[in-house]
């Protein structure tokens, strides 16, 4: 069910693009095709090469993204198609300068001097954006998401955008300076892997973002099950960064008995999140069990 | 303002427990987290350990671990440290205070003397 | 655990002078230290963080400095209600350490 046809706009583009990415990046890390046929791998391959060529007619003379070539560009959006050609680089051919050219955008179009990332033309479909829908600590979770997509497009866009690491360090000190004022664990979580990524979740903030979790095993706020799935799996990315080995079992235990395995409505970012974040700790974690994660990899009809 | 203030000193017998308390007043206690330290007679300052009034999450010194057990009430603004077993070297003063980027606000410390 | 120095455990000064007190810690703590003013009656207060941040109500005579492993505060025209005990801590690594202070007294 995670190996989807996409189709659309600019935006469900994204949203069918996402599990077939995360799927494939999943069983790569974690050696696991031969469970399901090598061969299946190659058309998971084309269904994303697919929604690679189809999300280039969403792509602004700006280098920006947006649900439609005439709409506002989506800083979002933008960031979110960073984070997810970042990872299939290593899986097709995708052009440095798509990907380069919307980092560049957003550092120069939507960063403030303050180092915070502003959205002028929220997506349409508020669904795919899972935990910083209706976040009321928006400029820090929008700063932290965008942070994590360019430090994810660092090493790719390094030579190509200059101000790429003076961006990063000033995204940086914003979530720095605030973090021990935030009050949604979810905000706390992808604030925590963005600093963690910079070797900043330190002291005070490694503080906030521990005890922020509930029973030690997940971060999470009254409402949507899916966001504390997410929120989760951006803290457990900060913890296998921080080589926090301690604290890790539980929260992958956690993670795993959510039986959550993506897909469905309003899914777009747990679904990326949590494969993510397991297929890093199977790779990480020094003795992991095996977790019994269910992939089911049915290829479309054609 | 910002106010941390603990319980009175405490004489206690080798072998017992104590529980410290620390009222905050002034913000909202929830928001922020409440760090404890331990001072002994003439000597510096130790880290114990930190509680997340909002969520219940701590973090203890290593050192601590087994001694000393922090909790909150949000319904009063208090938070406490328990320390079990207590021997001589558990003779000093504990403080609680209020992390921000550093300790930014303390509470005025409350003596503990442990002796037969 | 990250050791914190300060080899100076007493200073004498004179009112209106400028004091510096040096801190040093066992590795590179990345410009996490904060100062602390202990007065006689034991009340603790936060004066600096982040090497060189003033804390709220503290007065501009208070600064700080360093990086990597030095570091040091200076009251630069001492006064009467200066007269305290000061601790640096390294907010870089859990556990955090505290230096053992250094008393200020008036010669």
């Known amino acids: 069910h995670l190996i989807v046809t996409p189709s659309g706009c600019g935006e469900q583009n994204m949203i069918g693009m996402t599990p077939t990415v995360i799927a494939v990046h999943y069983l790569d890390e974690t050696e696991q095709w031969e469970k399901f046929g090598l061969e299946k791998r190659q058309g998971a391959l084309e269904l994303i090469k697919k929604g690679y060529t189809q999300q280039l007619a969403f792509r602004q003379p700006s280098s920006a993204f947006a649900a439609f070539v005439k709409r506002a560009p989506s800083t979002w959006l933008t960031a979110y198609v960073v984070k997810v050609f970042s990872l299939a680089v290593n899986l097709i051919a995708i052009d440095s300068q798509v990907l380069c050219g919307a980092v560049k955008w957003l550092i120069l179009e939507k960063q403030k001097p303050d180092g915070v990332f502003q959205e002028d033309a929220p997506v349409i479909h508020q669904e795919m954006i899972g935990g910083l829908r209706n976040n009321n600590e928006k400029d820090m979770a929008l700063t932290a998401f965008v942070l994590i997509s360019l430090q994810e497009a660092k090493d790719i866009c390094e030579e190509q955008v200059n101000s790429l690491p003076g961006s990063i360090t000033k995204a940086g000190d914003f979530l720095e300076a605030n973090y021990m004022n935030l009050q949604r664990s979810y905000t706390v979580a992808i604030a925590g892997y963005a600093l963690a990524q910079m070797g900043r979740l330190k002291g005070p903030l490694l503080n906030k973002f521990l005890t922020t979790a509930k029973d030690k095993n997940r971060w999470e706020d009254p409402g949507k099950q899916l966001y504390n799935v997410e929120a989760t799996s951006y803290a457990l990315l900060a913890l296998l960064q921080l080589k926090d080995f301690d604290f890790v079992p539980p929260v992958v235990r956690w993670l795993n008995e959510q039986r959550y395995y993506g897909g469905g409505y309003g899914s777009t970012q747990a679904t990326f999140m949590v494969f993510q974040a397991l297929a890093q700790y199977q790779k990480d974690a020094p003795d992991h069990q095996e977790l019994n994660l269910d992939v089911s990899l049915q290829l479309p009809s054609r | 303002q910002v106010q941390l203030q603990q319980s009175g000193a405490e004489l206690v017998r080798p072998g017992t427990s104590v529980k410290v308390s620390c009222k905050a007043s002034g913000y909202a206690f929830a928001h922020y987290l409440i760090e404890w330290v331990k001072q002994r007679p003439g000597q510096g300052l130790e880290w114990i350990g930190v509680?997340?009034?909002?969520?219940?999450?701590?973090n203890y010194n290593e050192k601590f671990k087994g001694k000393a057990t922090l909790t909150a009430d949000k319904s009063s603004s208090t938070a406490y440290m328990h320390l079990s077993s207590l021997t001589s070297e558990d003779s000093a003063v504990y403080f609680c205070a209020r992390e921000e980027l550093g300790f930014a606000y303390w509470g005025q410390g409350t003596l503990v003397t442990v002796s037969a | 655990d990250i050791q914190m120095t300060q080899s100076t455990s007493s200073l004498s000064a004179s009112l209106g002078d400028r004091v510096t007190i040096s801190c040093r810690a066992s590795?590179?703590?990345?410009?996490?230290l904060n100062w602390y003013q202990q007065r006689p009656d034991g009340t603790v207060k936060l004066l600096i963080y982040?090497?060189?941040r003033l804390h709220s109500g503290v007065p501009s005579r208070f600064s700080g400095s360093g990086s990597g492993t030095d570091y040091s505060l200076t009251i630069s025209n001492l006064e009467q209600e200066d007269i305290a005990t000061y601790f640096c801590q390294q907010g870089d690594t859990l556990p955090y350490t505290f230096g053992g202070g250094t008393t200020l007294e008036i010669r």
């Open positions: 982040y090497i060189s």
């Open positions: 509680i997340n009034p909002g969520t219940d999450g701590t």
């Open positions: 590795q590179d703590i990345s410009n996490h």
